[in-house]
């Protein structure tokens, strides 16, 4: 009964330093209270992006502060993360947890390559 | 460094009660679910308790359920178990542990010993 | 809930030897959420695998973990002297966790 998440391979980001993607999860049961966290795993390091918590049927609201925004749809969340610059290159995983009502399950997505490359500057025009 | 330091174990008579506390630092306490694990003298792995993030979902294990309380005070970096109606089979060396950021318990406390007895 | 199953209860193996654990689940568990602890005498559980096969911060490459569905393994390609100790297999996919009995490696 483990949770299966999917989200794609690779995503490019835009000159703007924006990324989208879809992560989808296969619900083992009918969750009302669903957290969403997008993770960056660098080397054998991981840390949290951003997270959200959001009741189903409600939008998904992250923190006034976060890089990342998003709405849900079933068991479909569309994650947008802005600001992003080519260092922030790497696997970006999504991981989606039922919070209630019971039982607890966790599902982790095999992550996201985020490619980044940052804009040339506009040349001096004389 | 990433710590969590646990108080609060000793003896008790059965039926009665005991606090313990969990003491985290390091990290940032509020953004990980905390669980409670118990190891009786000689035996395996038990889990216990489990309280996520802000503090308003938990999760007990059956042995426990009705008797025992988890709570958080993420102002305080501390985790709680409120332990009543205690009972002999709840002795044990009572572990706080994190729950990583991908899902495994990646740091525990020292332990902390309860022994219940009359 | 899913029941974890450690064999053998104990393994005699001399240092520098090779250790094989083995755990079975009642039922199918992710690869993704099934780790291995290694705990001392006296001392709190530390956590060596998570995902079945990725070694956690600061394990030595000896040690490797194998497996899916209701079968996985730990292996410790050459134990040294500290390895000697209990070993548990933990499902954190879903609730409740749950552990299996433990697998004690001692020196033979």
């Known amino acids: 009964k483990a949770m299966h998440v999917a989200q794609p391979a690779v995503v490019l980001a835009n000159s703007r330093g924006t990324a989208s993607f879809v992560c989808e999860y296969a619900s083992p049961g009918k969750a009302t209270e669903v957290r969403v966290t997008v993770l960056r795993q660098a080397d054998s390091q991981v840390t949290e992006v951003c997270a959200a918590t959001y009741m189903m049927g409600n939008e998904l609201t992250f923190l006034d502060d976060s890089i990342c925004t998003g709405t849900s749809s079933g068991n479909q969340v569309n994650l947008t993360i802005q600001g992003l610059r080519a260092m922030d290159t790497g696997l970006y995983i999504c991981k989606v947890e039922l919070m209630y009502p019971p039982p607890y399950y966790m599902g982790i997505g095999n992550g996201t390559q985020i490619y980044v490359i940052d804009p040339e500057p506009c040349p001096d025009s004389d | 460094q990433v710590q969590l330091v646990e108080s609060g174990g000793g003896v008790v008579q059965p039926g009665r009660s005991l606090r313990l506390s969990c003491a985290a630092s390091?990290?940032?306490?509020?953004?990980?679910?905390m669980h409670w694990v118990r190891q009786a003298p000689g035996t395996g792995l038990e889990w216990v308790a489990v309280i996520w993030y802000e503090g308003r979902n938990k999760y007990y294990a059956d042995p426990v359920k009705g008797r025992f309380t988890i709570s958080r005070d993420n102002s305080k970096n501390t985790l709680y178990l409120q332990m009543n109606s205690l009972r002999d089979d709840d002795t044990a060396v009572y572990y706080c542990?994190?729950?990583?950021?991908?899902?495994?318990?990646?740091?525990w406390g020292q332990g902390t010993m309860v022994t219940v007895s009359s | 809930e899913i029941v974890l199953t450690q064999s053998p209860g104990t393994l005699s193996l001399s240092p520098g030897e090779r250790a094989t654990l083995s755990c079975r689940a009642s039922q199918s568990v992710s690869s993704s959420y099934l780790a291995w602890y290694q705990q001392k005498p006296g001392q709190a559980p530390r956590l060596l695998i998570y995902?079945?096969?990725s070694r956690a911060t600061g394990i030595p490459d000896r040690f490797s973990g194998s497996g899916s569905g209701t079968d996985f393994t730990l292996t410790i390609s050459r134990l040294e002297p500290e390895d000697f100790a209990v070993y548990y297999c933990?499902?954190?996919?879903?609730?409740?966790?749950?552990s299996g009995q433990g697998t004690k490696v001692e020196i033979k």
């Open positions: 542990a994190r729950a990583g950021d991908l899902g495994a318990f990646d740091i």
């Open positions: 933990q499902q954190y996919g879903s609730s409740p966790w749950t």
């Open positions: 390091g990290f940032t306490f509020s953004s990980y679910g």
């Open positions: 995902g079945a096969s």
